[in-house]
Amino acid sequence: SERCDDWGLDTMRQIQVFEDEPARIKCPLFEHFLKFNYSTAHSAGLTLIWYWTRQDRDLEEPINFRLPENRISKEKDVLWFRPTLLNDTGNYTCMLRNTTYCSKVAFPLEVVQKDSCFNSPMKLPVHKLYIEYGIQRITCPNVDGYFPSSVKPTITWYMGCYKIQNFNNVIPEGMNLSFLIALISNNGNYTCVVTYPENGRTFHLTRTLTVKVVGSPKNAVPPVIHSPNDHVVYEKEPGEELLIPCTVYFSFLMDSRNEVWWTIDGKKPDDITIDVTINESISHSRTEDETRTQILSIKKVTSEDLKRSYVCHARSAKGEVAKAAKVKQKVPAPRYTVELACGFGAT
């Protein structure tokens, strides 16, 4: 056959769906690869063709759209499973073509099993709630387009394995779950089960997400440098190792880039002809506040190095701070017999 623009296997969209549930999968061509939508393509006389490769097979085969109860169907640019089966797992390809044009992309679809407590290998989206911040909501995700607005589904919410009813500060409100005042104890996996009728059958959609309670912007402060500080003096003799930790606390801030860096005499350490290494470690609190430590180390410090200015800098969306380390050359202790004795007139 003639050449086709092949976008390859789009592993960025690793689609996971639960077994025995409906799934609607849009052809990624129109969302991520082509500059026009399905209706434009359709009205220009292009046809959308679907096929697939089963898991652990190399053979591409057409999708069987003649299964009982139209289990698999296509509607515009959407491939429908009503419902999925475990052996639907594989790589699916959608191809847009006519006699002069062809473009295609493949994507992996994994049908996943869940247990009675909704545990599964499914990768879960994370929703962050601010601690003690007032009412916040999460919404049952990815249920649009499964049923018309005239259909009123029933929605049941679970935390872990437990149905949410009469919880202190968590209230189910249809597609939304409201947290009156989020606390660390609200961390966990939350599942909504959406049940709706279609053509005399009942379908369930299960959606699980992880709630993580994080520091509130109300409590956020600029970075705090705990070390270096005014109480510690790094007193070294030439030839010794100089180790200066820079320890910085960052409040949790959504989408903030936290950075820590050292300057030596106002310059980037790399820019200076000095054998310096910097090692970084990062730890997080339960509310995702961050502590970064960068240890500056000079294996064999020279007297010249001990005169330099060592400054730790830190920056977040809340501001930039800097602190200089107090570095000095150790004065050698006098040798009593020679120096002090001479002072007392000894000969």
Epitope: E259, W261, T263, D265, G266, K267, K268, D271, I272, T273, K307, R308, S309, V311, H313, R315, E320, A322, A324
Partner: antibody
């Protein structure tokens, strides 16, 4: 606001030396480099070198390392450049300019504030 | 030392025109390049640092671009106060070098 005030014009004899001052105000003097830049009449800019007041660290352009010497007086937030063995080639306007410190976000050491320049004329 | 090649050496343009000055470096300097403007008898003024970051108070008709070894300064719709000399400078490491300059004159 940041201000760099340079000393006045100098008329000097060949073979002698000259010391130009640059008084800084409006920022923390110790934490920024003071750079020195030469501009001969009708010519471009030449970087002479820099000094870091907090530690007296210096870097010199190879072409000037035997000619220029930088010092600072921390108490008065003033930087000095001494130019020695003067010849007619040293007739120029000399600028001091502030740079750095390095920032993860703003990169390296652009010269963000400049003094008004000191004119040095070497003539017998 | 890093060599800076700035072009053109001089340039004539009219008010309202758009001009571009380029600067090439002898080795990769990432984005550590600054542009300065200098008017006759005055001190230079920082326009752009880190290749594309406008300095405080610089009008948005100025823009810097490039990285590695190729850089440019673009001035959109020239104003009378834009005429003068322009210099590039790498601000990297422990030795800073200026380009030879571009004199922008009124046509």
């Amino acid at each position: 606001q940041v201000h760099l005030q340079q000393s006045g014009p100098e008329l000097v004899r060949p073979g002698t030396s000259v010391k130009i001052s640059c008084e800084a105000s409006g920022y923390i003097f110790l934490t920024y480099w003071i750079n020195w830049v030469k501009q001969r009449p009708g010519q471009g800019l030449e970087w002479i070198g820099q000094i870091f007041p907090a530690s007296d660290s210096t870097y010199y352009n190879e072409m000037f390392k035997d000619k220029a010497r930088f010092t600072v007086d921390k108490s008065s937030s003033t930087a000095y450049m001494q130019f020695s063995s003067l010849t007619s080639e040293d007739t120029a306007v000399y600028f001091c300019a502030r740079s750095g410190p390095y920032s993860y976000y703003a990169g390296g050491y652009a010269l963000d504030y400049w003094g008004q320049g000191t004119s040095v004329t070497v003539s017998s | 030392d890093i060599q800076m090649t700035q072009s053109p050496a001089s340039l004539s343009a009219s008010v309202g025109e758009t001009v571009t000055i380029t600067c090439r470096t002898s080795e990769n300097i990432n984005s550590y390049l600054a542009w300065y403007q200098q008017k006759q008898g005055k001190s230079p003024q920082l326009l752009v640092h880190y290749a594309k970051t406008l300095a405080e108070g610089v009008p948005s008709r100025f823009s810097g671009s490039g990285s590695g070894t190729q850089f440019s300064l673009k001035i959109n719709s020239l104003k009378p106060e834009d005429f003068g000399s322009y210099y590039c400078q790498h601000h990297y490491g422990t030795s800073l070098t200026f380009g030879a300059g571009t004199k922008l004159e009124l046509k």
